[in-house]
């Protein structure tokens, strides 16, 4: 065995640049650090066969399978994949190890399978086997967490039925409003499924796995807070668990809390109470209303009453199917080049949506914020003043929603010119869409003031680049203007821009650009 080379097999994951396609041994990608694949002699195999750990790759991911050989002298090699031989060019690294690489760009089903590397060294021949498969993320799920009461204990269990098994954490905050943002110092995270400390101001449970992160907030009515101007509303789908927490603080223990649904006390077994003294010796009571699996008749106004506080209510609405309510009519905006502006969509949805903003085939992360009136809002400000079409897309388990926006940036036209044997054309993007004039420059008109009206053809908007309109104007060549300089000018309310063209022979001859404001 000591005569055998020491083999190291590694996997290098690449972060794709969009330009990468095909197999290559140059690296047009940012690489993550190599991962050891534990290459080992395959037990009970005839001949010297090394095997690497099974490799799972996401669809469209790019990887390199690499073998490092610690063997004296030169090596020659051959890759075989699905009975086809592939070229193999070993090189040597700084430690004088032979290095052989196979780059798989943009992984597809056809590139999955067994990759065999045959190596011949001065001492021996051996084979290295890589098995590459596509990670089956179709089986992956990430479900929103829900709560259950822990048997015989005053504690909540957070459950998320997801694959792969998610990491569950409680996100707790004892401040009000903005200071309860995820990364705020007021936020405490506990990576466990069971929570005993249920007196906090804001309690959320989050589950995360390869597909992302989903959170559920414990719906709370705080009798010490001024009620919202609109009644808080909680949506649930039939079969989901209902949890509402009512919280109240009083100077002493001499108060009680009760839950009513449509003026009828909740049945025993649908609520439980906890109390504690806070640091300033005031008494905190919480009363949970819960239904393990809601039906349509659980819809209604849930009211929490206290003998020492004004009562408050929440409207619980049970729906058969999730929804996204918002106006989907397209919206057009016209802004100045440096004007601050954000697109925004106001919607009501259940379950919570996943959303994206898209511009020019690029997707941008989408943030949503809950408003006091039960609506949510998503804003997009990262348009960098690029005109065009912006798309907001939202979906949840049961519904989809798309809204289009057009952004126009008010600016002076900029002109590009080109000429052929028979015509001259000018293009401009400015907004509002420009109008055109053509002028002839001659001895009689050295300042190019002689207007050309014959043979001019304007196209208001001949090209739409991701929603950005381009206006063009074409001048057909006539004997009267051949050999002369002509000037095309585009103008709108913000200014004028011109380009001068020499009309003599084919080829683009933009000559001088005048910028006239």
């Amino acid at each position: 065995n000591q005569d055998l080379p020491v083999i190291k097999c590694v996997l290098i994951n690449h972060k794709n640049n969009d330009s990468s396609v095909g197999k290559s041994s140059s690296y047009p990608m940012v690489s993550e650090s190599p991962e050891d694949l534990g290459c080992a002699l395959r037990p009970q195999s005839s001949g010297t066969v090394y095997e690497a750990a099974a490799v799972e790759v996401d669809v469209s991911a790019s990887i390199t399978l690499q073998v490092l050989v610690d063997a004296p002298g030169n090596i020659s090699c051959l890759w075989v994949f699905k009975h086809s031989s592939l070229n193999c060019q070993p090189h040597f690294d700084l430690q004088n190890r032979g290095v052989v690489s196979m780059v798989i760009l943009k992984m597809t089903e056809t590139q999955a399978g067994e990759y065999l590397l045959f190596i011949q060294s001065e001492a021996t021949n051996y084979t290295i086997l890589f098995t590459v498969s596509i990670r089956n993320t179709l089986l992956y799920t990430l479900r929103r967490p829900y709560f259950r009461k822990m048997e015989n204990q005053d504690a909540l269990v957070c459950i998320s039925e997801s694959v792969p098994e998610p990491i569950v954490e409680w996100v707790l905050c004892d401040s009000q409003g903005e200071s309860c943002k995820e990364e705020s110092p007021a936020v405490v995270k506990k990576e466990e499924k069971v929570l005993h400390e249920l007196f906090g101001t804001d309690i959320r449970c989050c589950a995360r796995n390869e597909l992302g992160r989903e959170c559920t907030r414990l719906f709370t009515i705080d009798l010490n807070q001024t009620p919202q101007t609109t009644l808080p509303q909680l949506f649930l789908k039939v079969g989901e668990p209902l949890w509402i927490r009512c919280k109240a603080v009083h100077v002493n223990h001499g108060f009680g809390l009760t839950w009513e649904l449509e003026n009828k006390a909740l049945e025993e077994g649908n609520y439980f109470e906890m109390s504690t003294y806070s640091t300033n010796r005031t008494m905190i009571r919480i009363l949970f209303a819960f239904v393990s699996s809601v039906a349509r008749n659980d819809t209604g106004y849930y009211t929490c009453s206290s003998s020492k506080h004004p009562s408050q209510s929440a409207l619980v609405t049970i729906v058969e199917k999730g929804f996204i309510n918002a106006t989907n009519s397209s919206e057009d905006y016209e802004i100045d080049q440096y004007e601050e502006f954000c697109f925004s969509v106001r919607f009501k949805a259940y379950p919570q949506i996943r959303c994206t903003w898209t511009f020019s085939r690029k997707s941008f992360p989408c943030e949503q914020k809950g408003l006091d009136n039960g609506y949510s809002i998503s804003k997009f400000c990262n348009h960098k003043h690029q005109p065009g079409e912006y798309i907001f897309h939202a979906e949840n388990d049961d519904a989809q929603f798309t809204k289009m926006f057009t952004l126009n940036i008010r600016r002076k036209p900029q002109v590009l010119a080109e000429a052929s044997a028979s015509q001259a054309s000018c293009f401009s993007d400015g907004y509002p869409l420009p109008s055109w004039t053509w002028k002839k420059c001659s001895d009689k008109s050295p300042n190019c003031t002689e207007e050309i009206t014959e043979g001019v053809w304007n196209r208001k908007a001949n090209r739409k680049v991701f929603g950005q309109w381009v206006s063009s104007s074409t001048l057909n060549m006539s004997e009267a203007i051949k050999g002369f300089l002509v000037k095309c000018c585009a103008y709108n309310s913000l200014g004028t821009s011109c380009e001068t063209i020499l009309l003599n022979s084919p080829g683009p001859f933009p000559f001088i650009q005048d910028n006239i404001s």
Epitope: L11, N13, S33, P34, E35, D36, L37, G38, A40, R42, P43, Q44, E51, A52, A53, A54, V55, E56, E114, L129, F130, T131, S133, R135, P164, E165
Partner: antibody, heavy 124, light 107 residues
Framework: QVTLKESGPTLVKPTETLTLTCTLS??????????VSWIRQPPGKCLEWLAH???????SYSTSLKNRLTISKDSSKTQVVLTMTNVDPVDTATYYC????????????????WGQGTLVTVSS | DIQMTQSPSSLSASVGDRVTITCRAS??????LGWYQQKPGKAPKRLIY???TLQSGVPSRFSGSGSGTEFTLTISSLQPEDFATYYC?????????FGCGTKVEIK
């Protein structure tokens, strides 16, 4: 360079919960059949396998300790955490984590790399 | 659970000796067995996997044999660095179980 490094408290009181972390480098649990096991060895005694976790979240536990153990991995797949509840002085041991490799043709290589171990003493 | 019985529990030998350590499984485990060497204060190191395949970088004086319930680790010519404790591990079924070790001491 493959390394596994155990970390956690050196002293724990009886009935408390022990949390140990194994930090991986040179490989991760992102790959199809990579796994990590926890193994312990009381001073001067035999090795005892405790639990393992694979990249696909498949888990197994020692029969005698399964009610007290939880094994998990972090989202970056470079840390494996073992928690042991209700510890007792008999849980005093050096705790090791070690790598498992699942090969393409279906066989598994157990414990080709080990961490250096961390000694945990359970005492009041 | 599968019990792994290792024998002897300790042995004394001299440099150059041939040393044999045995591991017996309480039920058949095919060839799902590994051998590990541990030196005081150090983590174990894998020598043999799949009952008889030598770990890369391990000297060829170490060899493993056996299948089913009887397994053997042989050191053909004991070297000074081989004085250590040797463990077998079955990974045929859960829970995984180790033998309780054979301590190889200098005679």
């Amino acid at each position: 360079q493959v390394t596994l490094k155990e970390s956690g408290p050196t002293l724990v009181k009886p009935t408390e919960t022990l949390t140990l972390t194994c930090t991986l480098s040179g490989f991760s649990l992102n790959n199809a059949r990579m796994g990590v096991s926890w193994i312990r060895q009381p001073p001067g005694k035999c090795l005892e396998w405790l639990a393992h976790i694979f990249s696909n979240d498949e888990k197994s536990y020692s029969t005698s300790l399964k009610n007290r153990l939880t094994i998990s991995k972090d989202s970056s797949k470079t840390q494996v955490v073992l928690t042991m509840t209700n510890v007792d002085p008999v849980d005093t041991a050096t705790y090791y984590c070690a790598r498992i490799v699942g090969y393409g043709s279906g066989w598994y290589g157990f414990f080709d790399y080990w961490g250096q171990g961390t000694l945990v003493t359970v005492s009041s | 659970d599968i019990q792994m019985t290792q024998s002897p529990s300790s042995l004394s030998a001299s440099v150059g000796d041939r040393v044999t350590i045995t591991c017996r499984a309480s039920q058949g485990i095919r060839n799902d067995l590994g051998w590990y060497q541990q030196k005081p204060g150090k983590a174990p190191k894998r020598l043999i996997y799949a009952a008889s395949t030598l770990q890369s970088g391990v000297p060829s004086r170490f060899s493993g044999s056996g299948s089913g319930t009887e397994f053997t680790l042989t050191i053909s010519s004991l070297q000074p660095e081989d004085f250590a404790t040797y463990y077998c591990l079955q990974h045929n079924s859960y829970p995984l179980t180790f033998g309780c070790g054979t301590k190889v001491e200098i005679k």
